[in-house]
């Protein structure tokens, strides 16, 4: 699997996790969220050469067409494969509320 | 939905389904295939810009954060969302065989 | 372990070309950014620029006419190029790892090099 | 730019006391500062950041603190080898900046 046990512990040019820090105020401009300041949200980088974690048929026809047709900028992406959710505390007035944004950190990717 | 009826229709530079039609023999070197010769497999290109088509929450993140550091290459990317089955004949032998191979034929497209 | 350690020369001429090299160990470069940050003697810190573990740059728009960074994953280094040195460039340089890209402090650092500029 | 002020230039503390250090910001950083501790011919340390986290590895009399725009490292009682040059630095925006640094020297 393309996930952190793997990728963060190893040279890897293809398709991989890659960690990344998001702080909610700082990049997103985010100043609803009190807690936490930011979180590991990760995300997917890397070439997707043939046969390197393809999703589908469809991401193993391209990639090996892309190998004869280099220029058609036809090849699969590395995308987010599981995600996890994020449990967040914001404030209504003065009311604290404690919610789980889904789909916030991304644990390991693939070819699609 | 960024599928044909759109994108086909559409000058769009951001994510959307474009138009490829793959020939088994010479894209692929794929020689067991005796029909159809090719197909128009289609394929997901283009920018994700804040909030085009993002799949998750994460890729709206993701999207977010690139606008300020587009040198991070953390921008999400635009893949295949609804997929299609392709019918085929193929032979074992002299024996005529017909199999569907899924997820072939990409309908529409997303940022993920 | 993480390591970092930078060489190169330590004395160029006015108007010459600087070729810093970064070499790390214990993590891998295409996980992990590294950045560079130089300290005149006896002064403070600056900062001067990174490449991302994906290979993107970011300069401190002070120098960046001047600054190339690159990488060789492989090889586990990163090079930097600083162009038409100044005896004002003279200083200890430092290549330095974020402990998460996007945190941006730097929580290993190489022991240093001192660069002198003269002629 | 991010300027980043640090005083005093220099602080003049005995072995088992206090030593309060400051750093101001030019303008909001949302607590993305950090210190660190140099001392002659080695390369900074890092102690703090994210103005009140301790770095792994660190000693627990360094503390971080923030109120408002100002930002303090507290050693709360002096070991020999904390007698250094220390630096703030803000982690908020490109490009990141350090203060000009404070020695701590034994009085």
């Known amino acids: 699997a393309l996930d952190a046990a793997y990728c963060f512990r190893n040279v890897q040019d293809n398709c991989c996790l890659r960690p990344l820090y998001i702080d909610f105020k700082r990049d997103l401009g985010w100043k609803w969220i009190h807690e936490p300041k930011g979180y590991n949200a990760n995300f997917c980088a890397g070439a997707c050469p043939y046969l390197w974690s393809s999703d589908t048929q469809h991401s193993r026809v391209l990639s090996l067409y892309n190998t004869i047709n280099p220029e058609a900028s036809a090849s699969p992406c590395c995308v987010s494969q599981d995600l996890e959710p994020l449990t967040i505390l914001y404030y209504i007035g003065k009311t604290p509320k404690i919610e789980q944004l889904s789909n916030m950190i991304v644990k390991s990717c693939k070819c699609s | 939905a960024l599928d044909a009826a759109y994108c086909f229709r559409n000058v769009q530079d951001n994510c959307c389904l474009r138009p490829l039609y793959i020939d088994f023999k010479r894209d692929l070197g794929w020689k067991w295939i005796h029909e159809p010769k090719g197909y128009n497999a289609n394929f997901c290109a283009g920018a994700c810009p804040y909030l085009w088509s993002s799949d998750t929450q994460h890729s709206r993140v993701l999207s977010l954060y690139n606008t300020i550091n587009p040198e991070a290459s953390a921008s999400p990317c635009c893949v295949s969302q609804d997929l299609e089955p392709l019918t085929i004949l193929y032979y074992i032998g002299k024996t005529p065989k017909i199999e569907q191979l899924s997820n072939m034929i990409v309908k529409s497209c997303k940022c993920s | 372990e993480v390591t970092l350690k930078e060489s190169g020369p330590v004395l160029v001429k006015p108007t010459e070309t600087l070729t810093l090299t970064c070499t790390v160990s214990?993590?891998?470069?295409?996980?992990?950014?590294v950045h560079w940050v130089r300290q005149p003697p006896g002064k403070a810190l600056e900062w001067m620029g990174l490449?991302?573990?994906?290979?993107?740059?970011r300069y401190n728009s002070a120098l960046k006419s001047r600054l190339t960074i690159s990488k060789d994953t492989s090889k586990s280094q990163v090079v930097l190029t600083m162009t038409n040195m100044d005896p004002v460039d003279t200083a200890t340089y430092y290549c330095?790892?974020?402990?998460?890209?996007?945190?941006?402090?730097?929580?290993?650092w190489g022991p240093g090099t001192l660069v002198t500029v003269s002629s | 730019e991010i300027v980043m002020t640090q005083s005093p230039a220099t602080l003049s503390v005995s072995p088992g006391e206090r030593a309060t250090l400051s750093c101001l910001a030019s303008?909001?950083?949302?607590?993305?500062l950090a210190w660190y501790q140099q001392k002659p011919g080695q390369s900074p340390r890092l102690l703090i950041y994210?103005?009140?986290s301790l770095q792994d590895g660190v000693p627990a009399r360094f503390s971080g603190s923030e109120s408002g725009p100002e930002y303090t490292l507290t050693i709360s009682s002096l070991q020999s080898e904390d007698f250094a040059v220390y630096f703030c630095?803000?982690?908020?925006?490109?490009?990141?900046?350090f203060g000009q640094g404070t020695k701590v020297e034994i009085k």
């Open positions: 630095q803000q982690h908020h925006a490109y490009p990141f900046t």
């Open positions: 994210d103005a009140r």
């Open positions: 214990g993590f891998s470069l295409t996980t992990y950014n």
């Open positions: 330095a790892r974020d402990p998460v890209p996007n945190k941006w402090h730097f929580d290993f």
């Open positions: 490449i991302w573990n994906t290979g993107g740059t």
């Open positions: 303008e909001d950083i949302y607590s993305n």
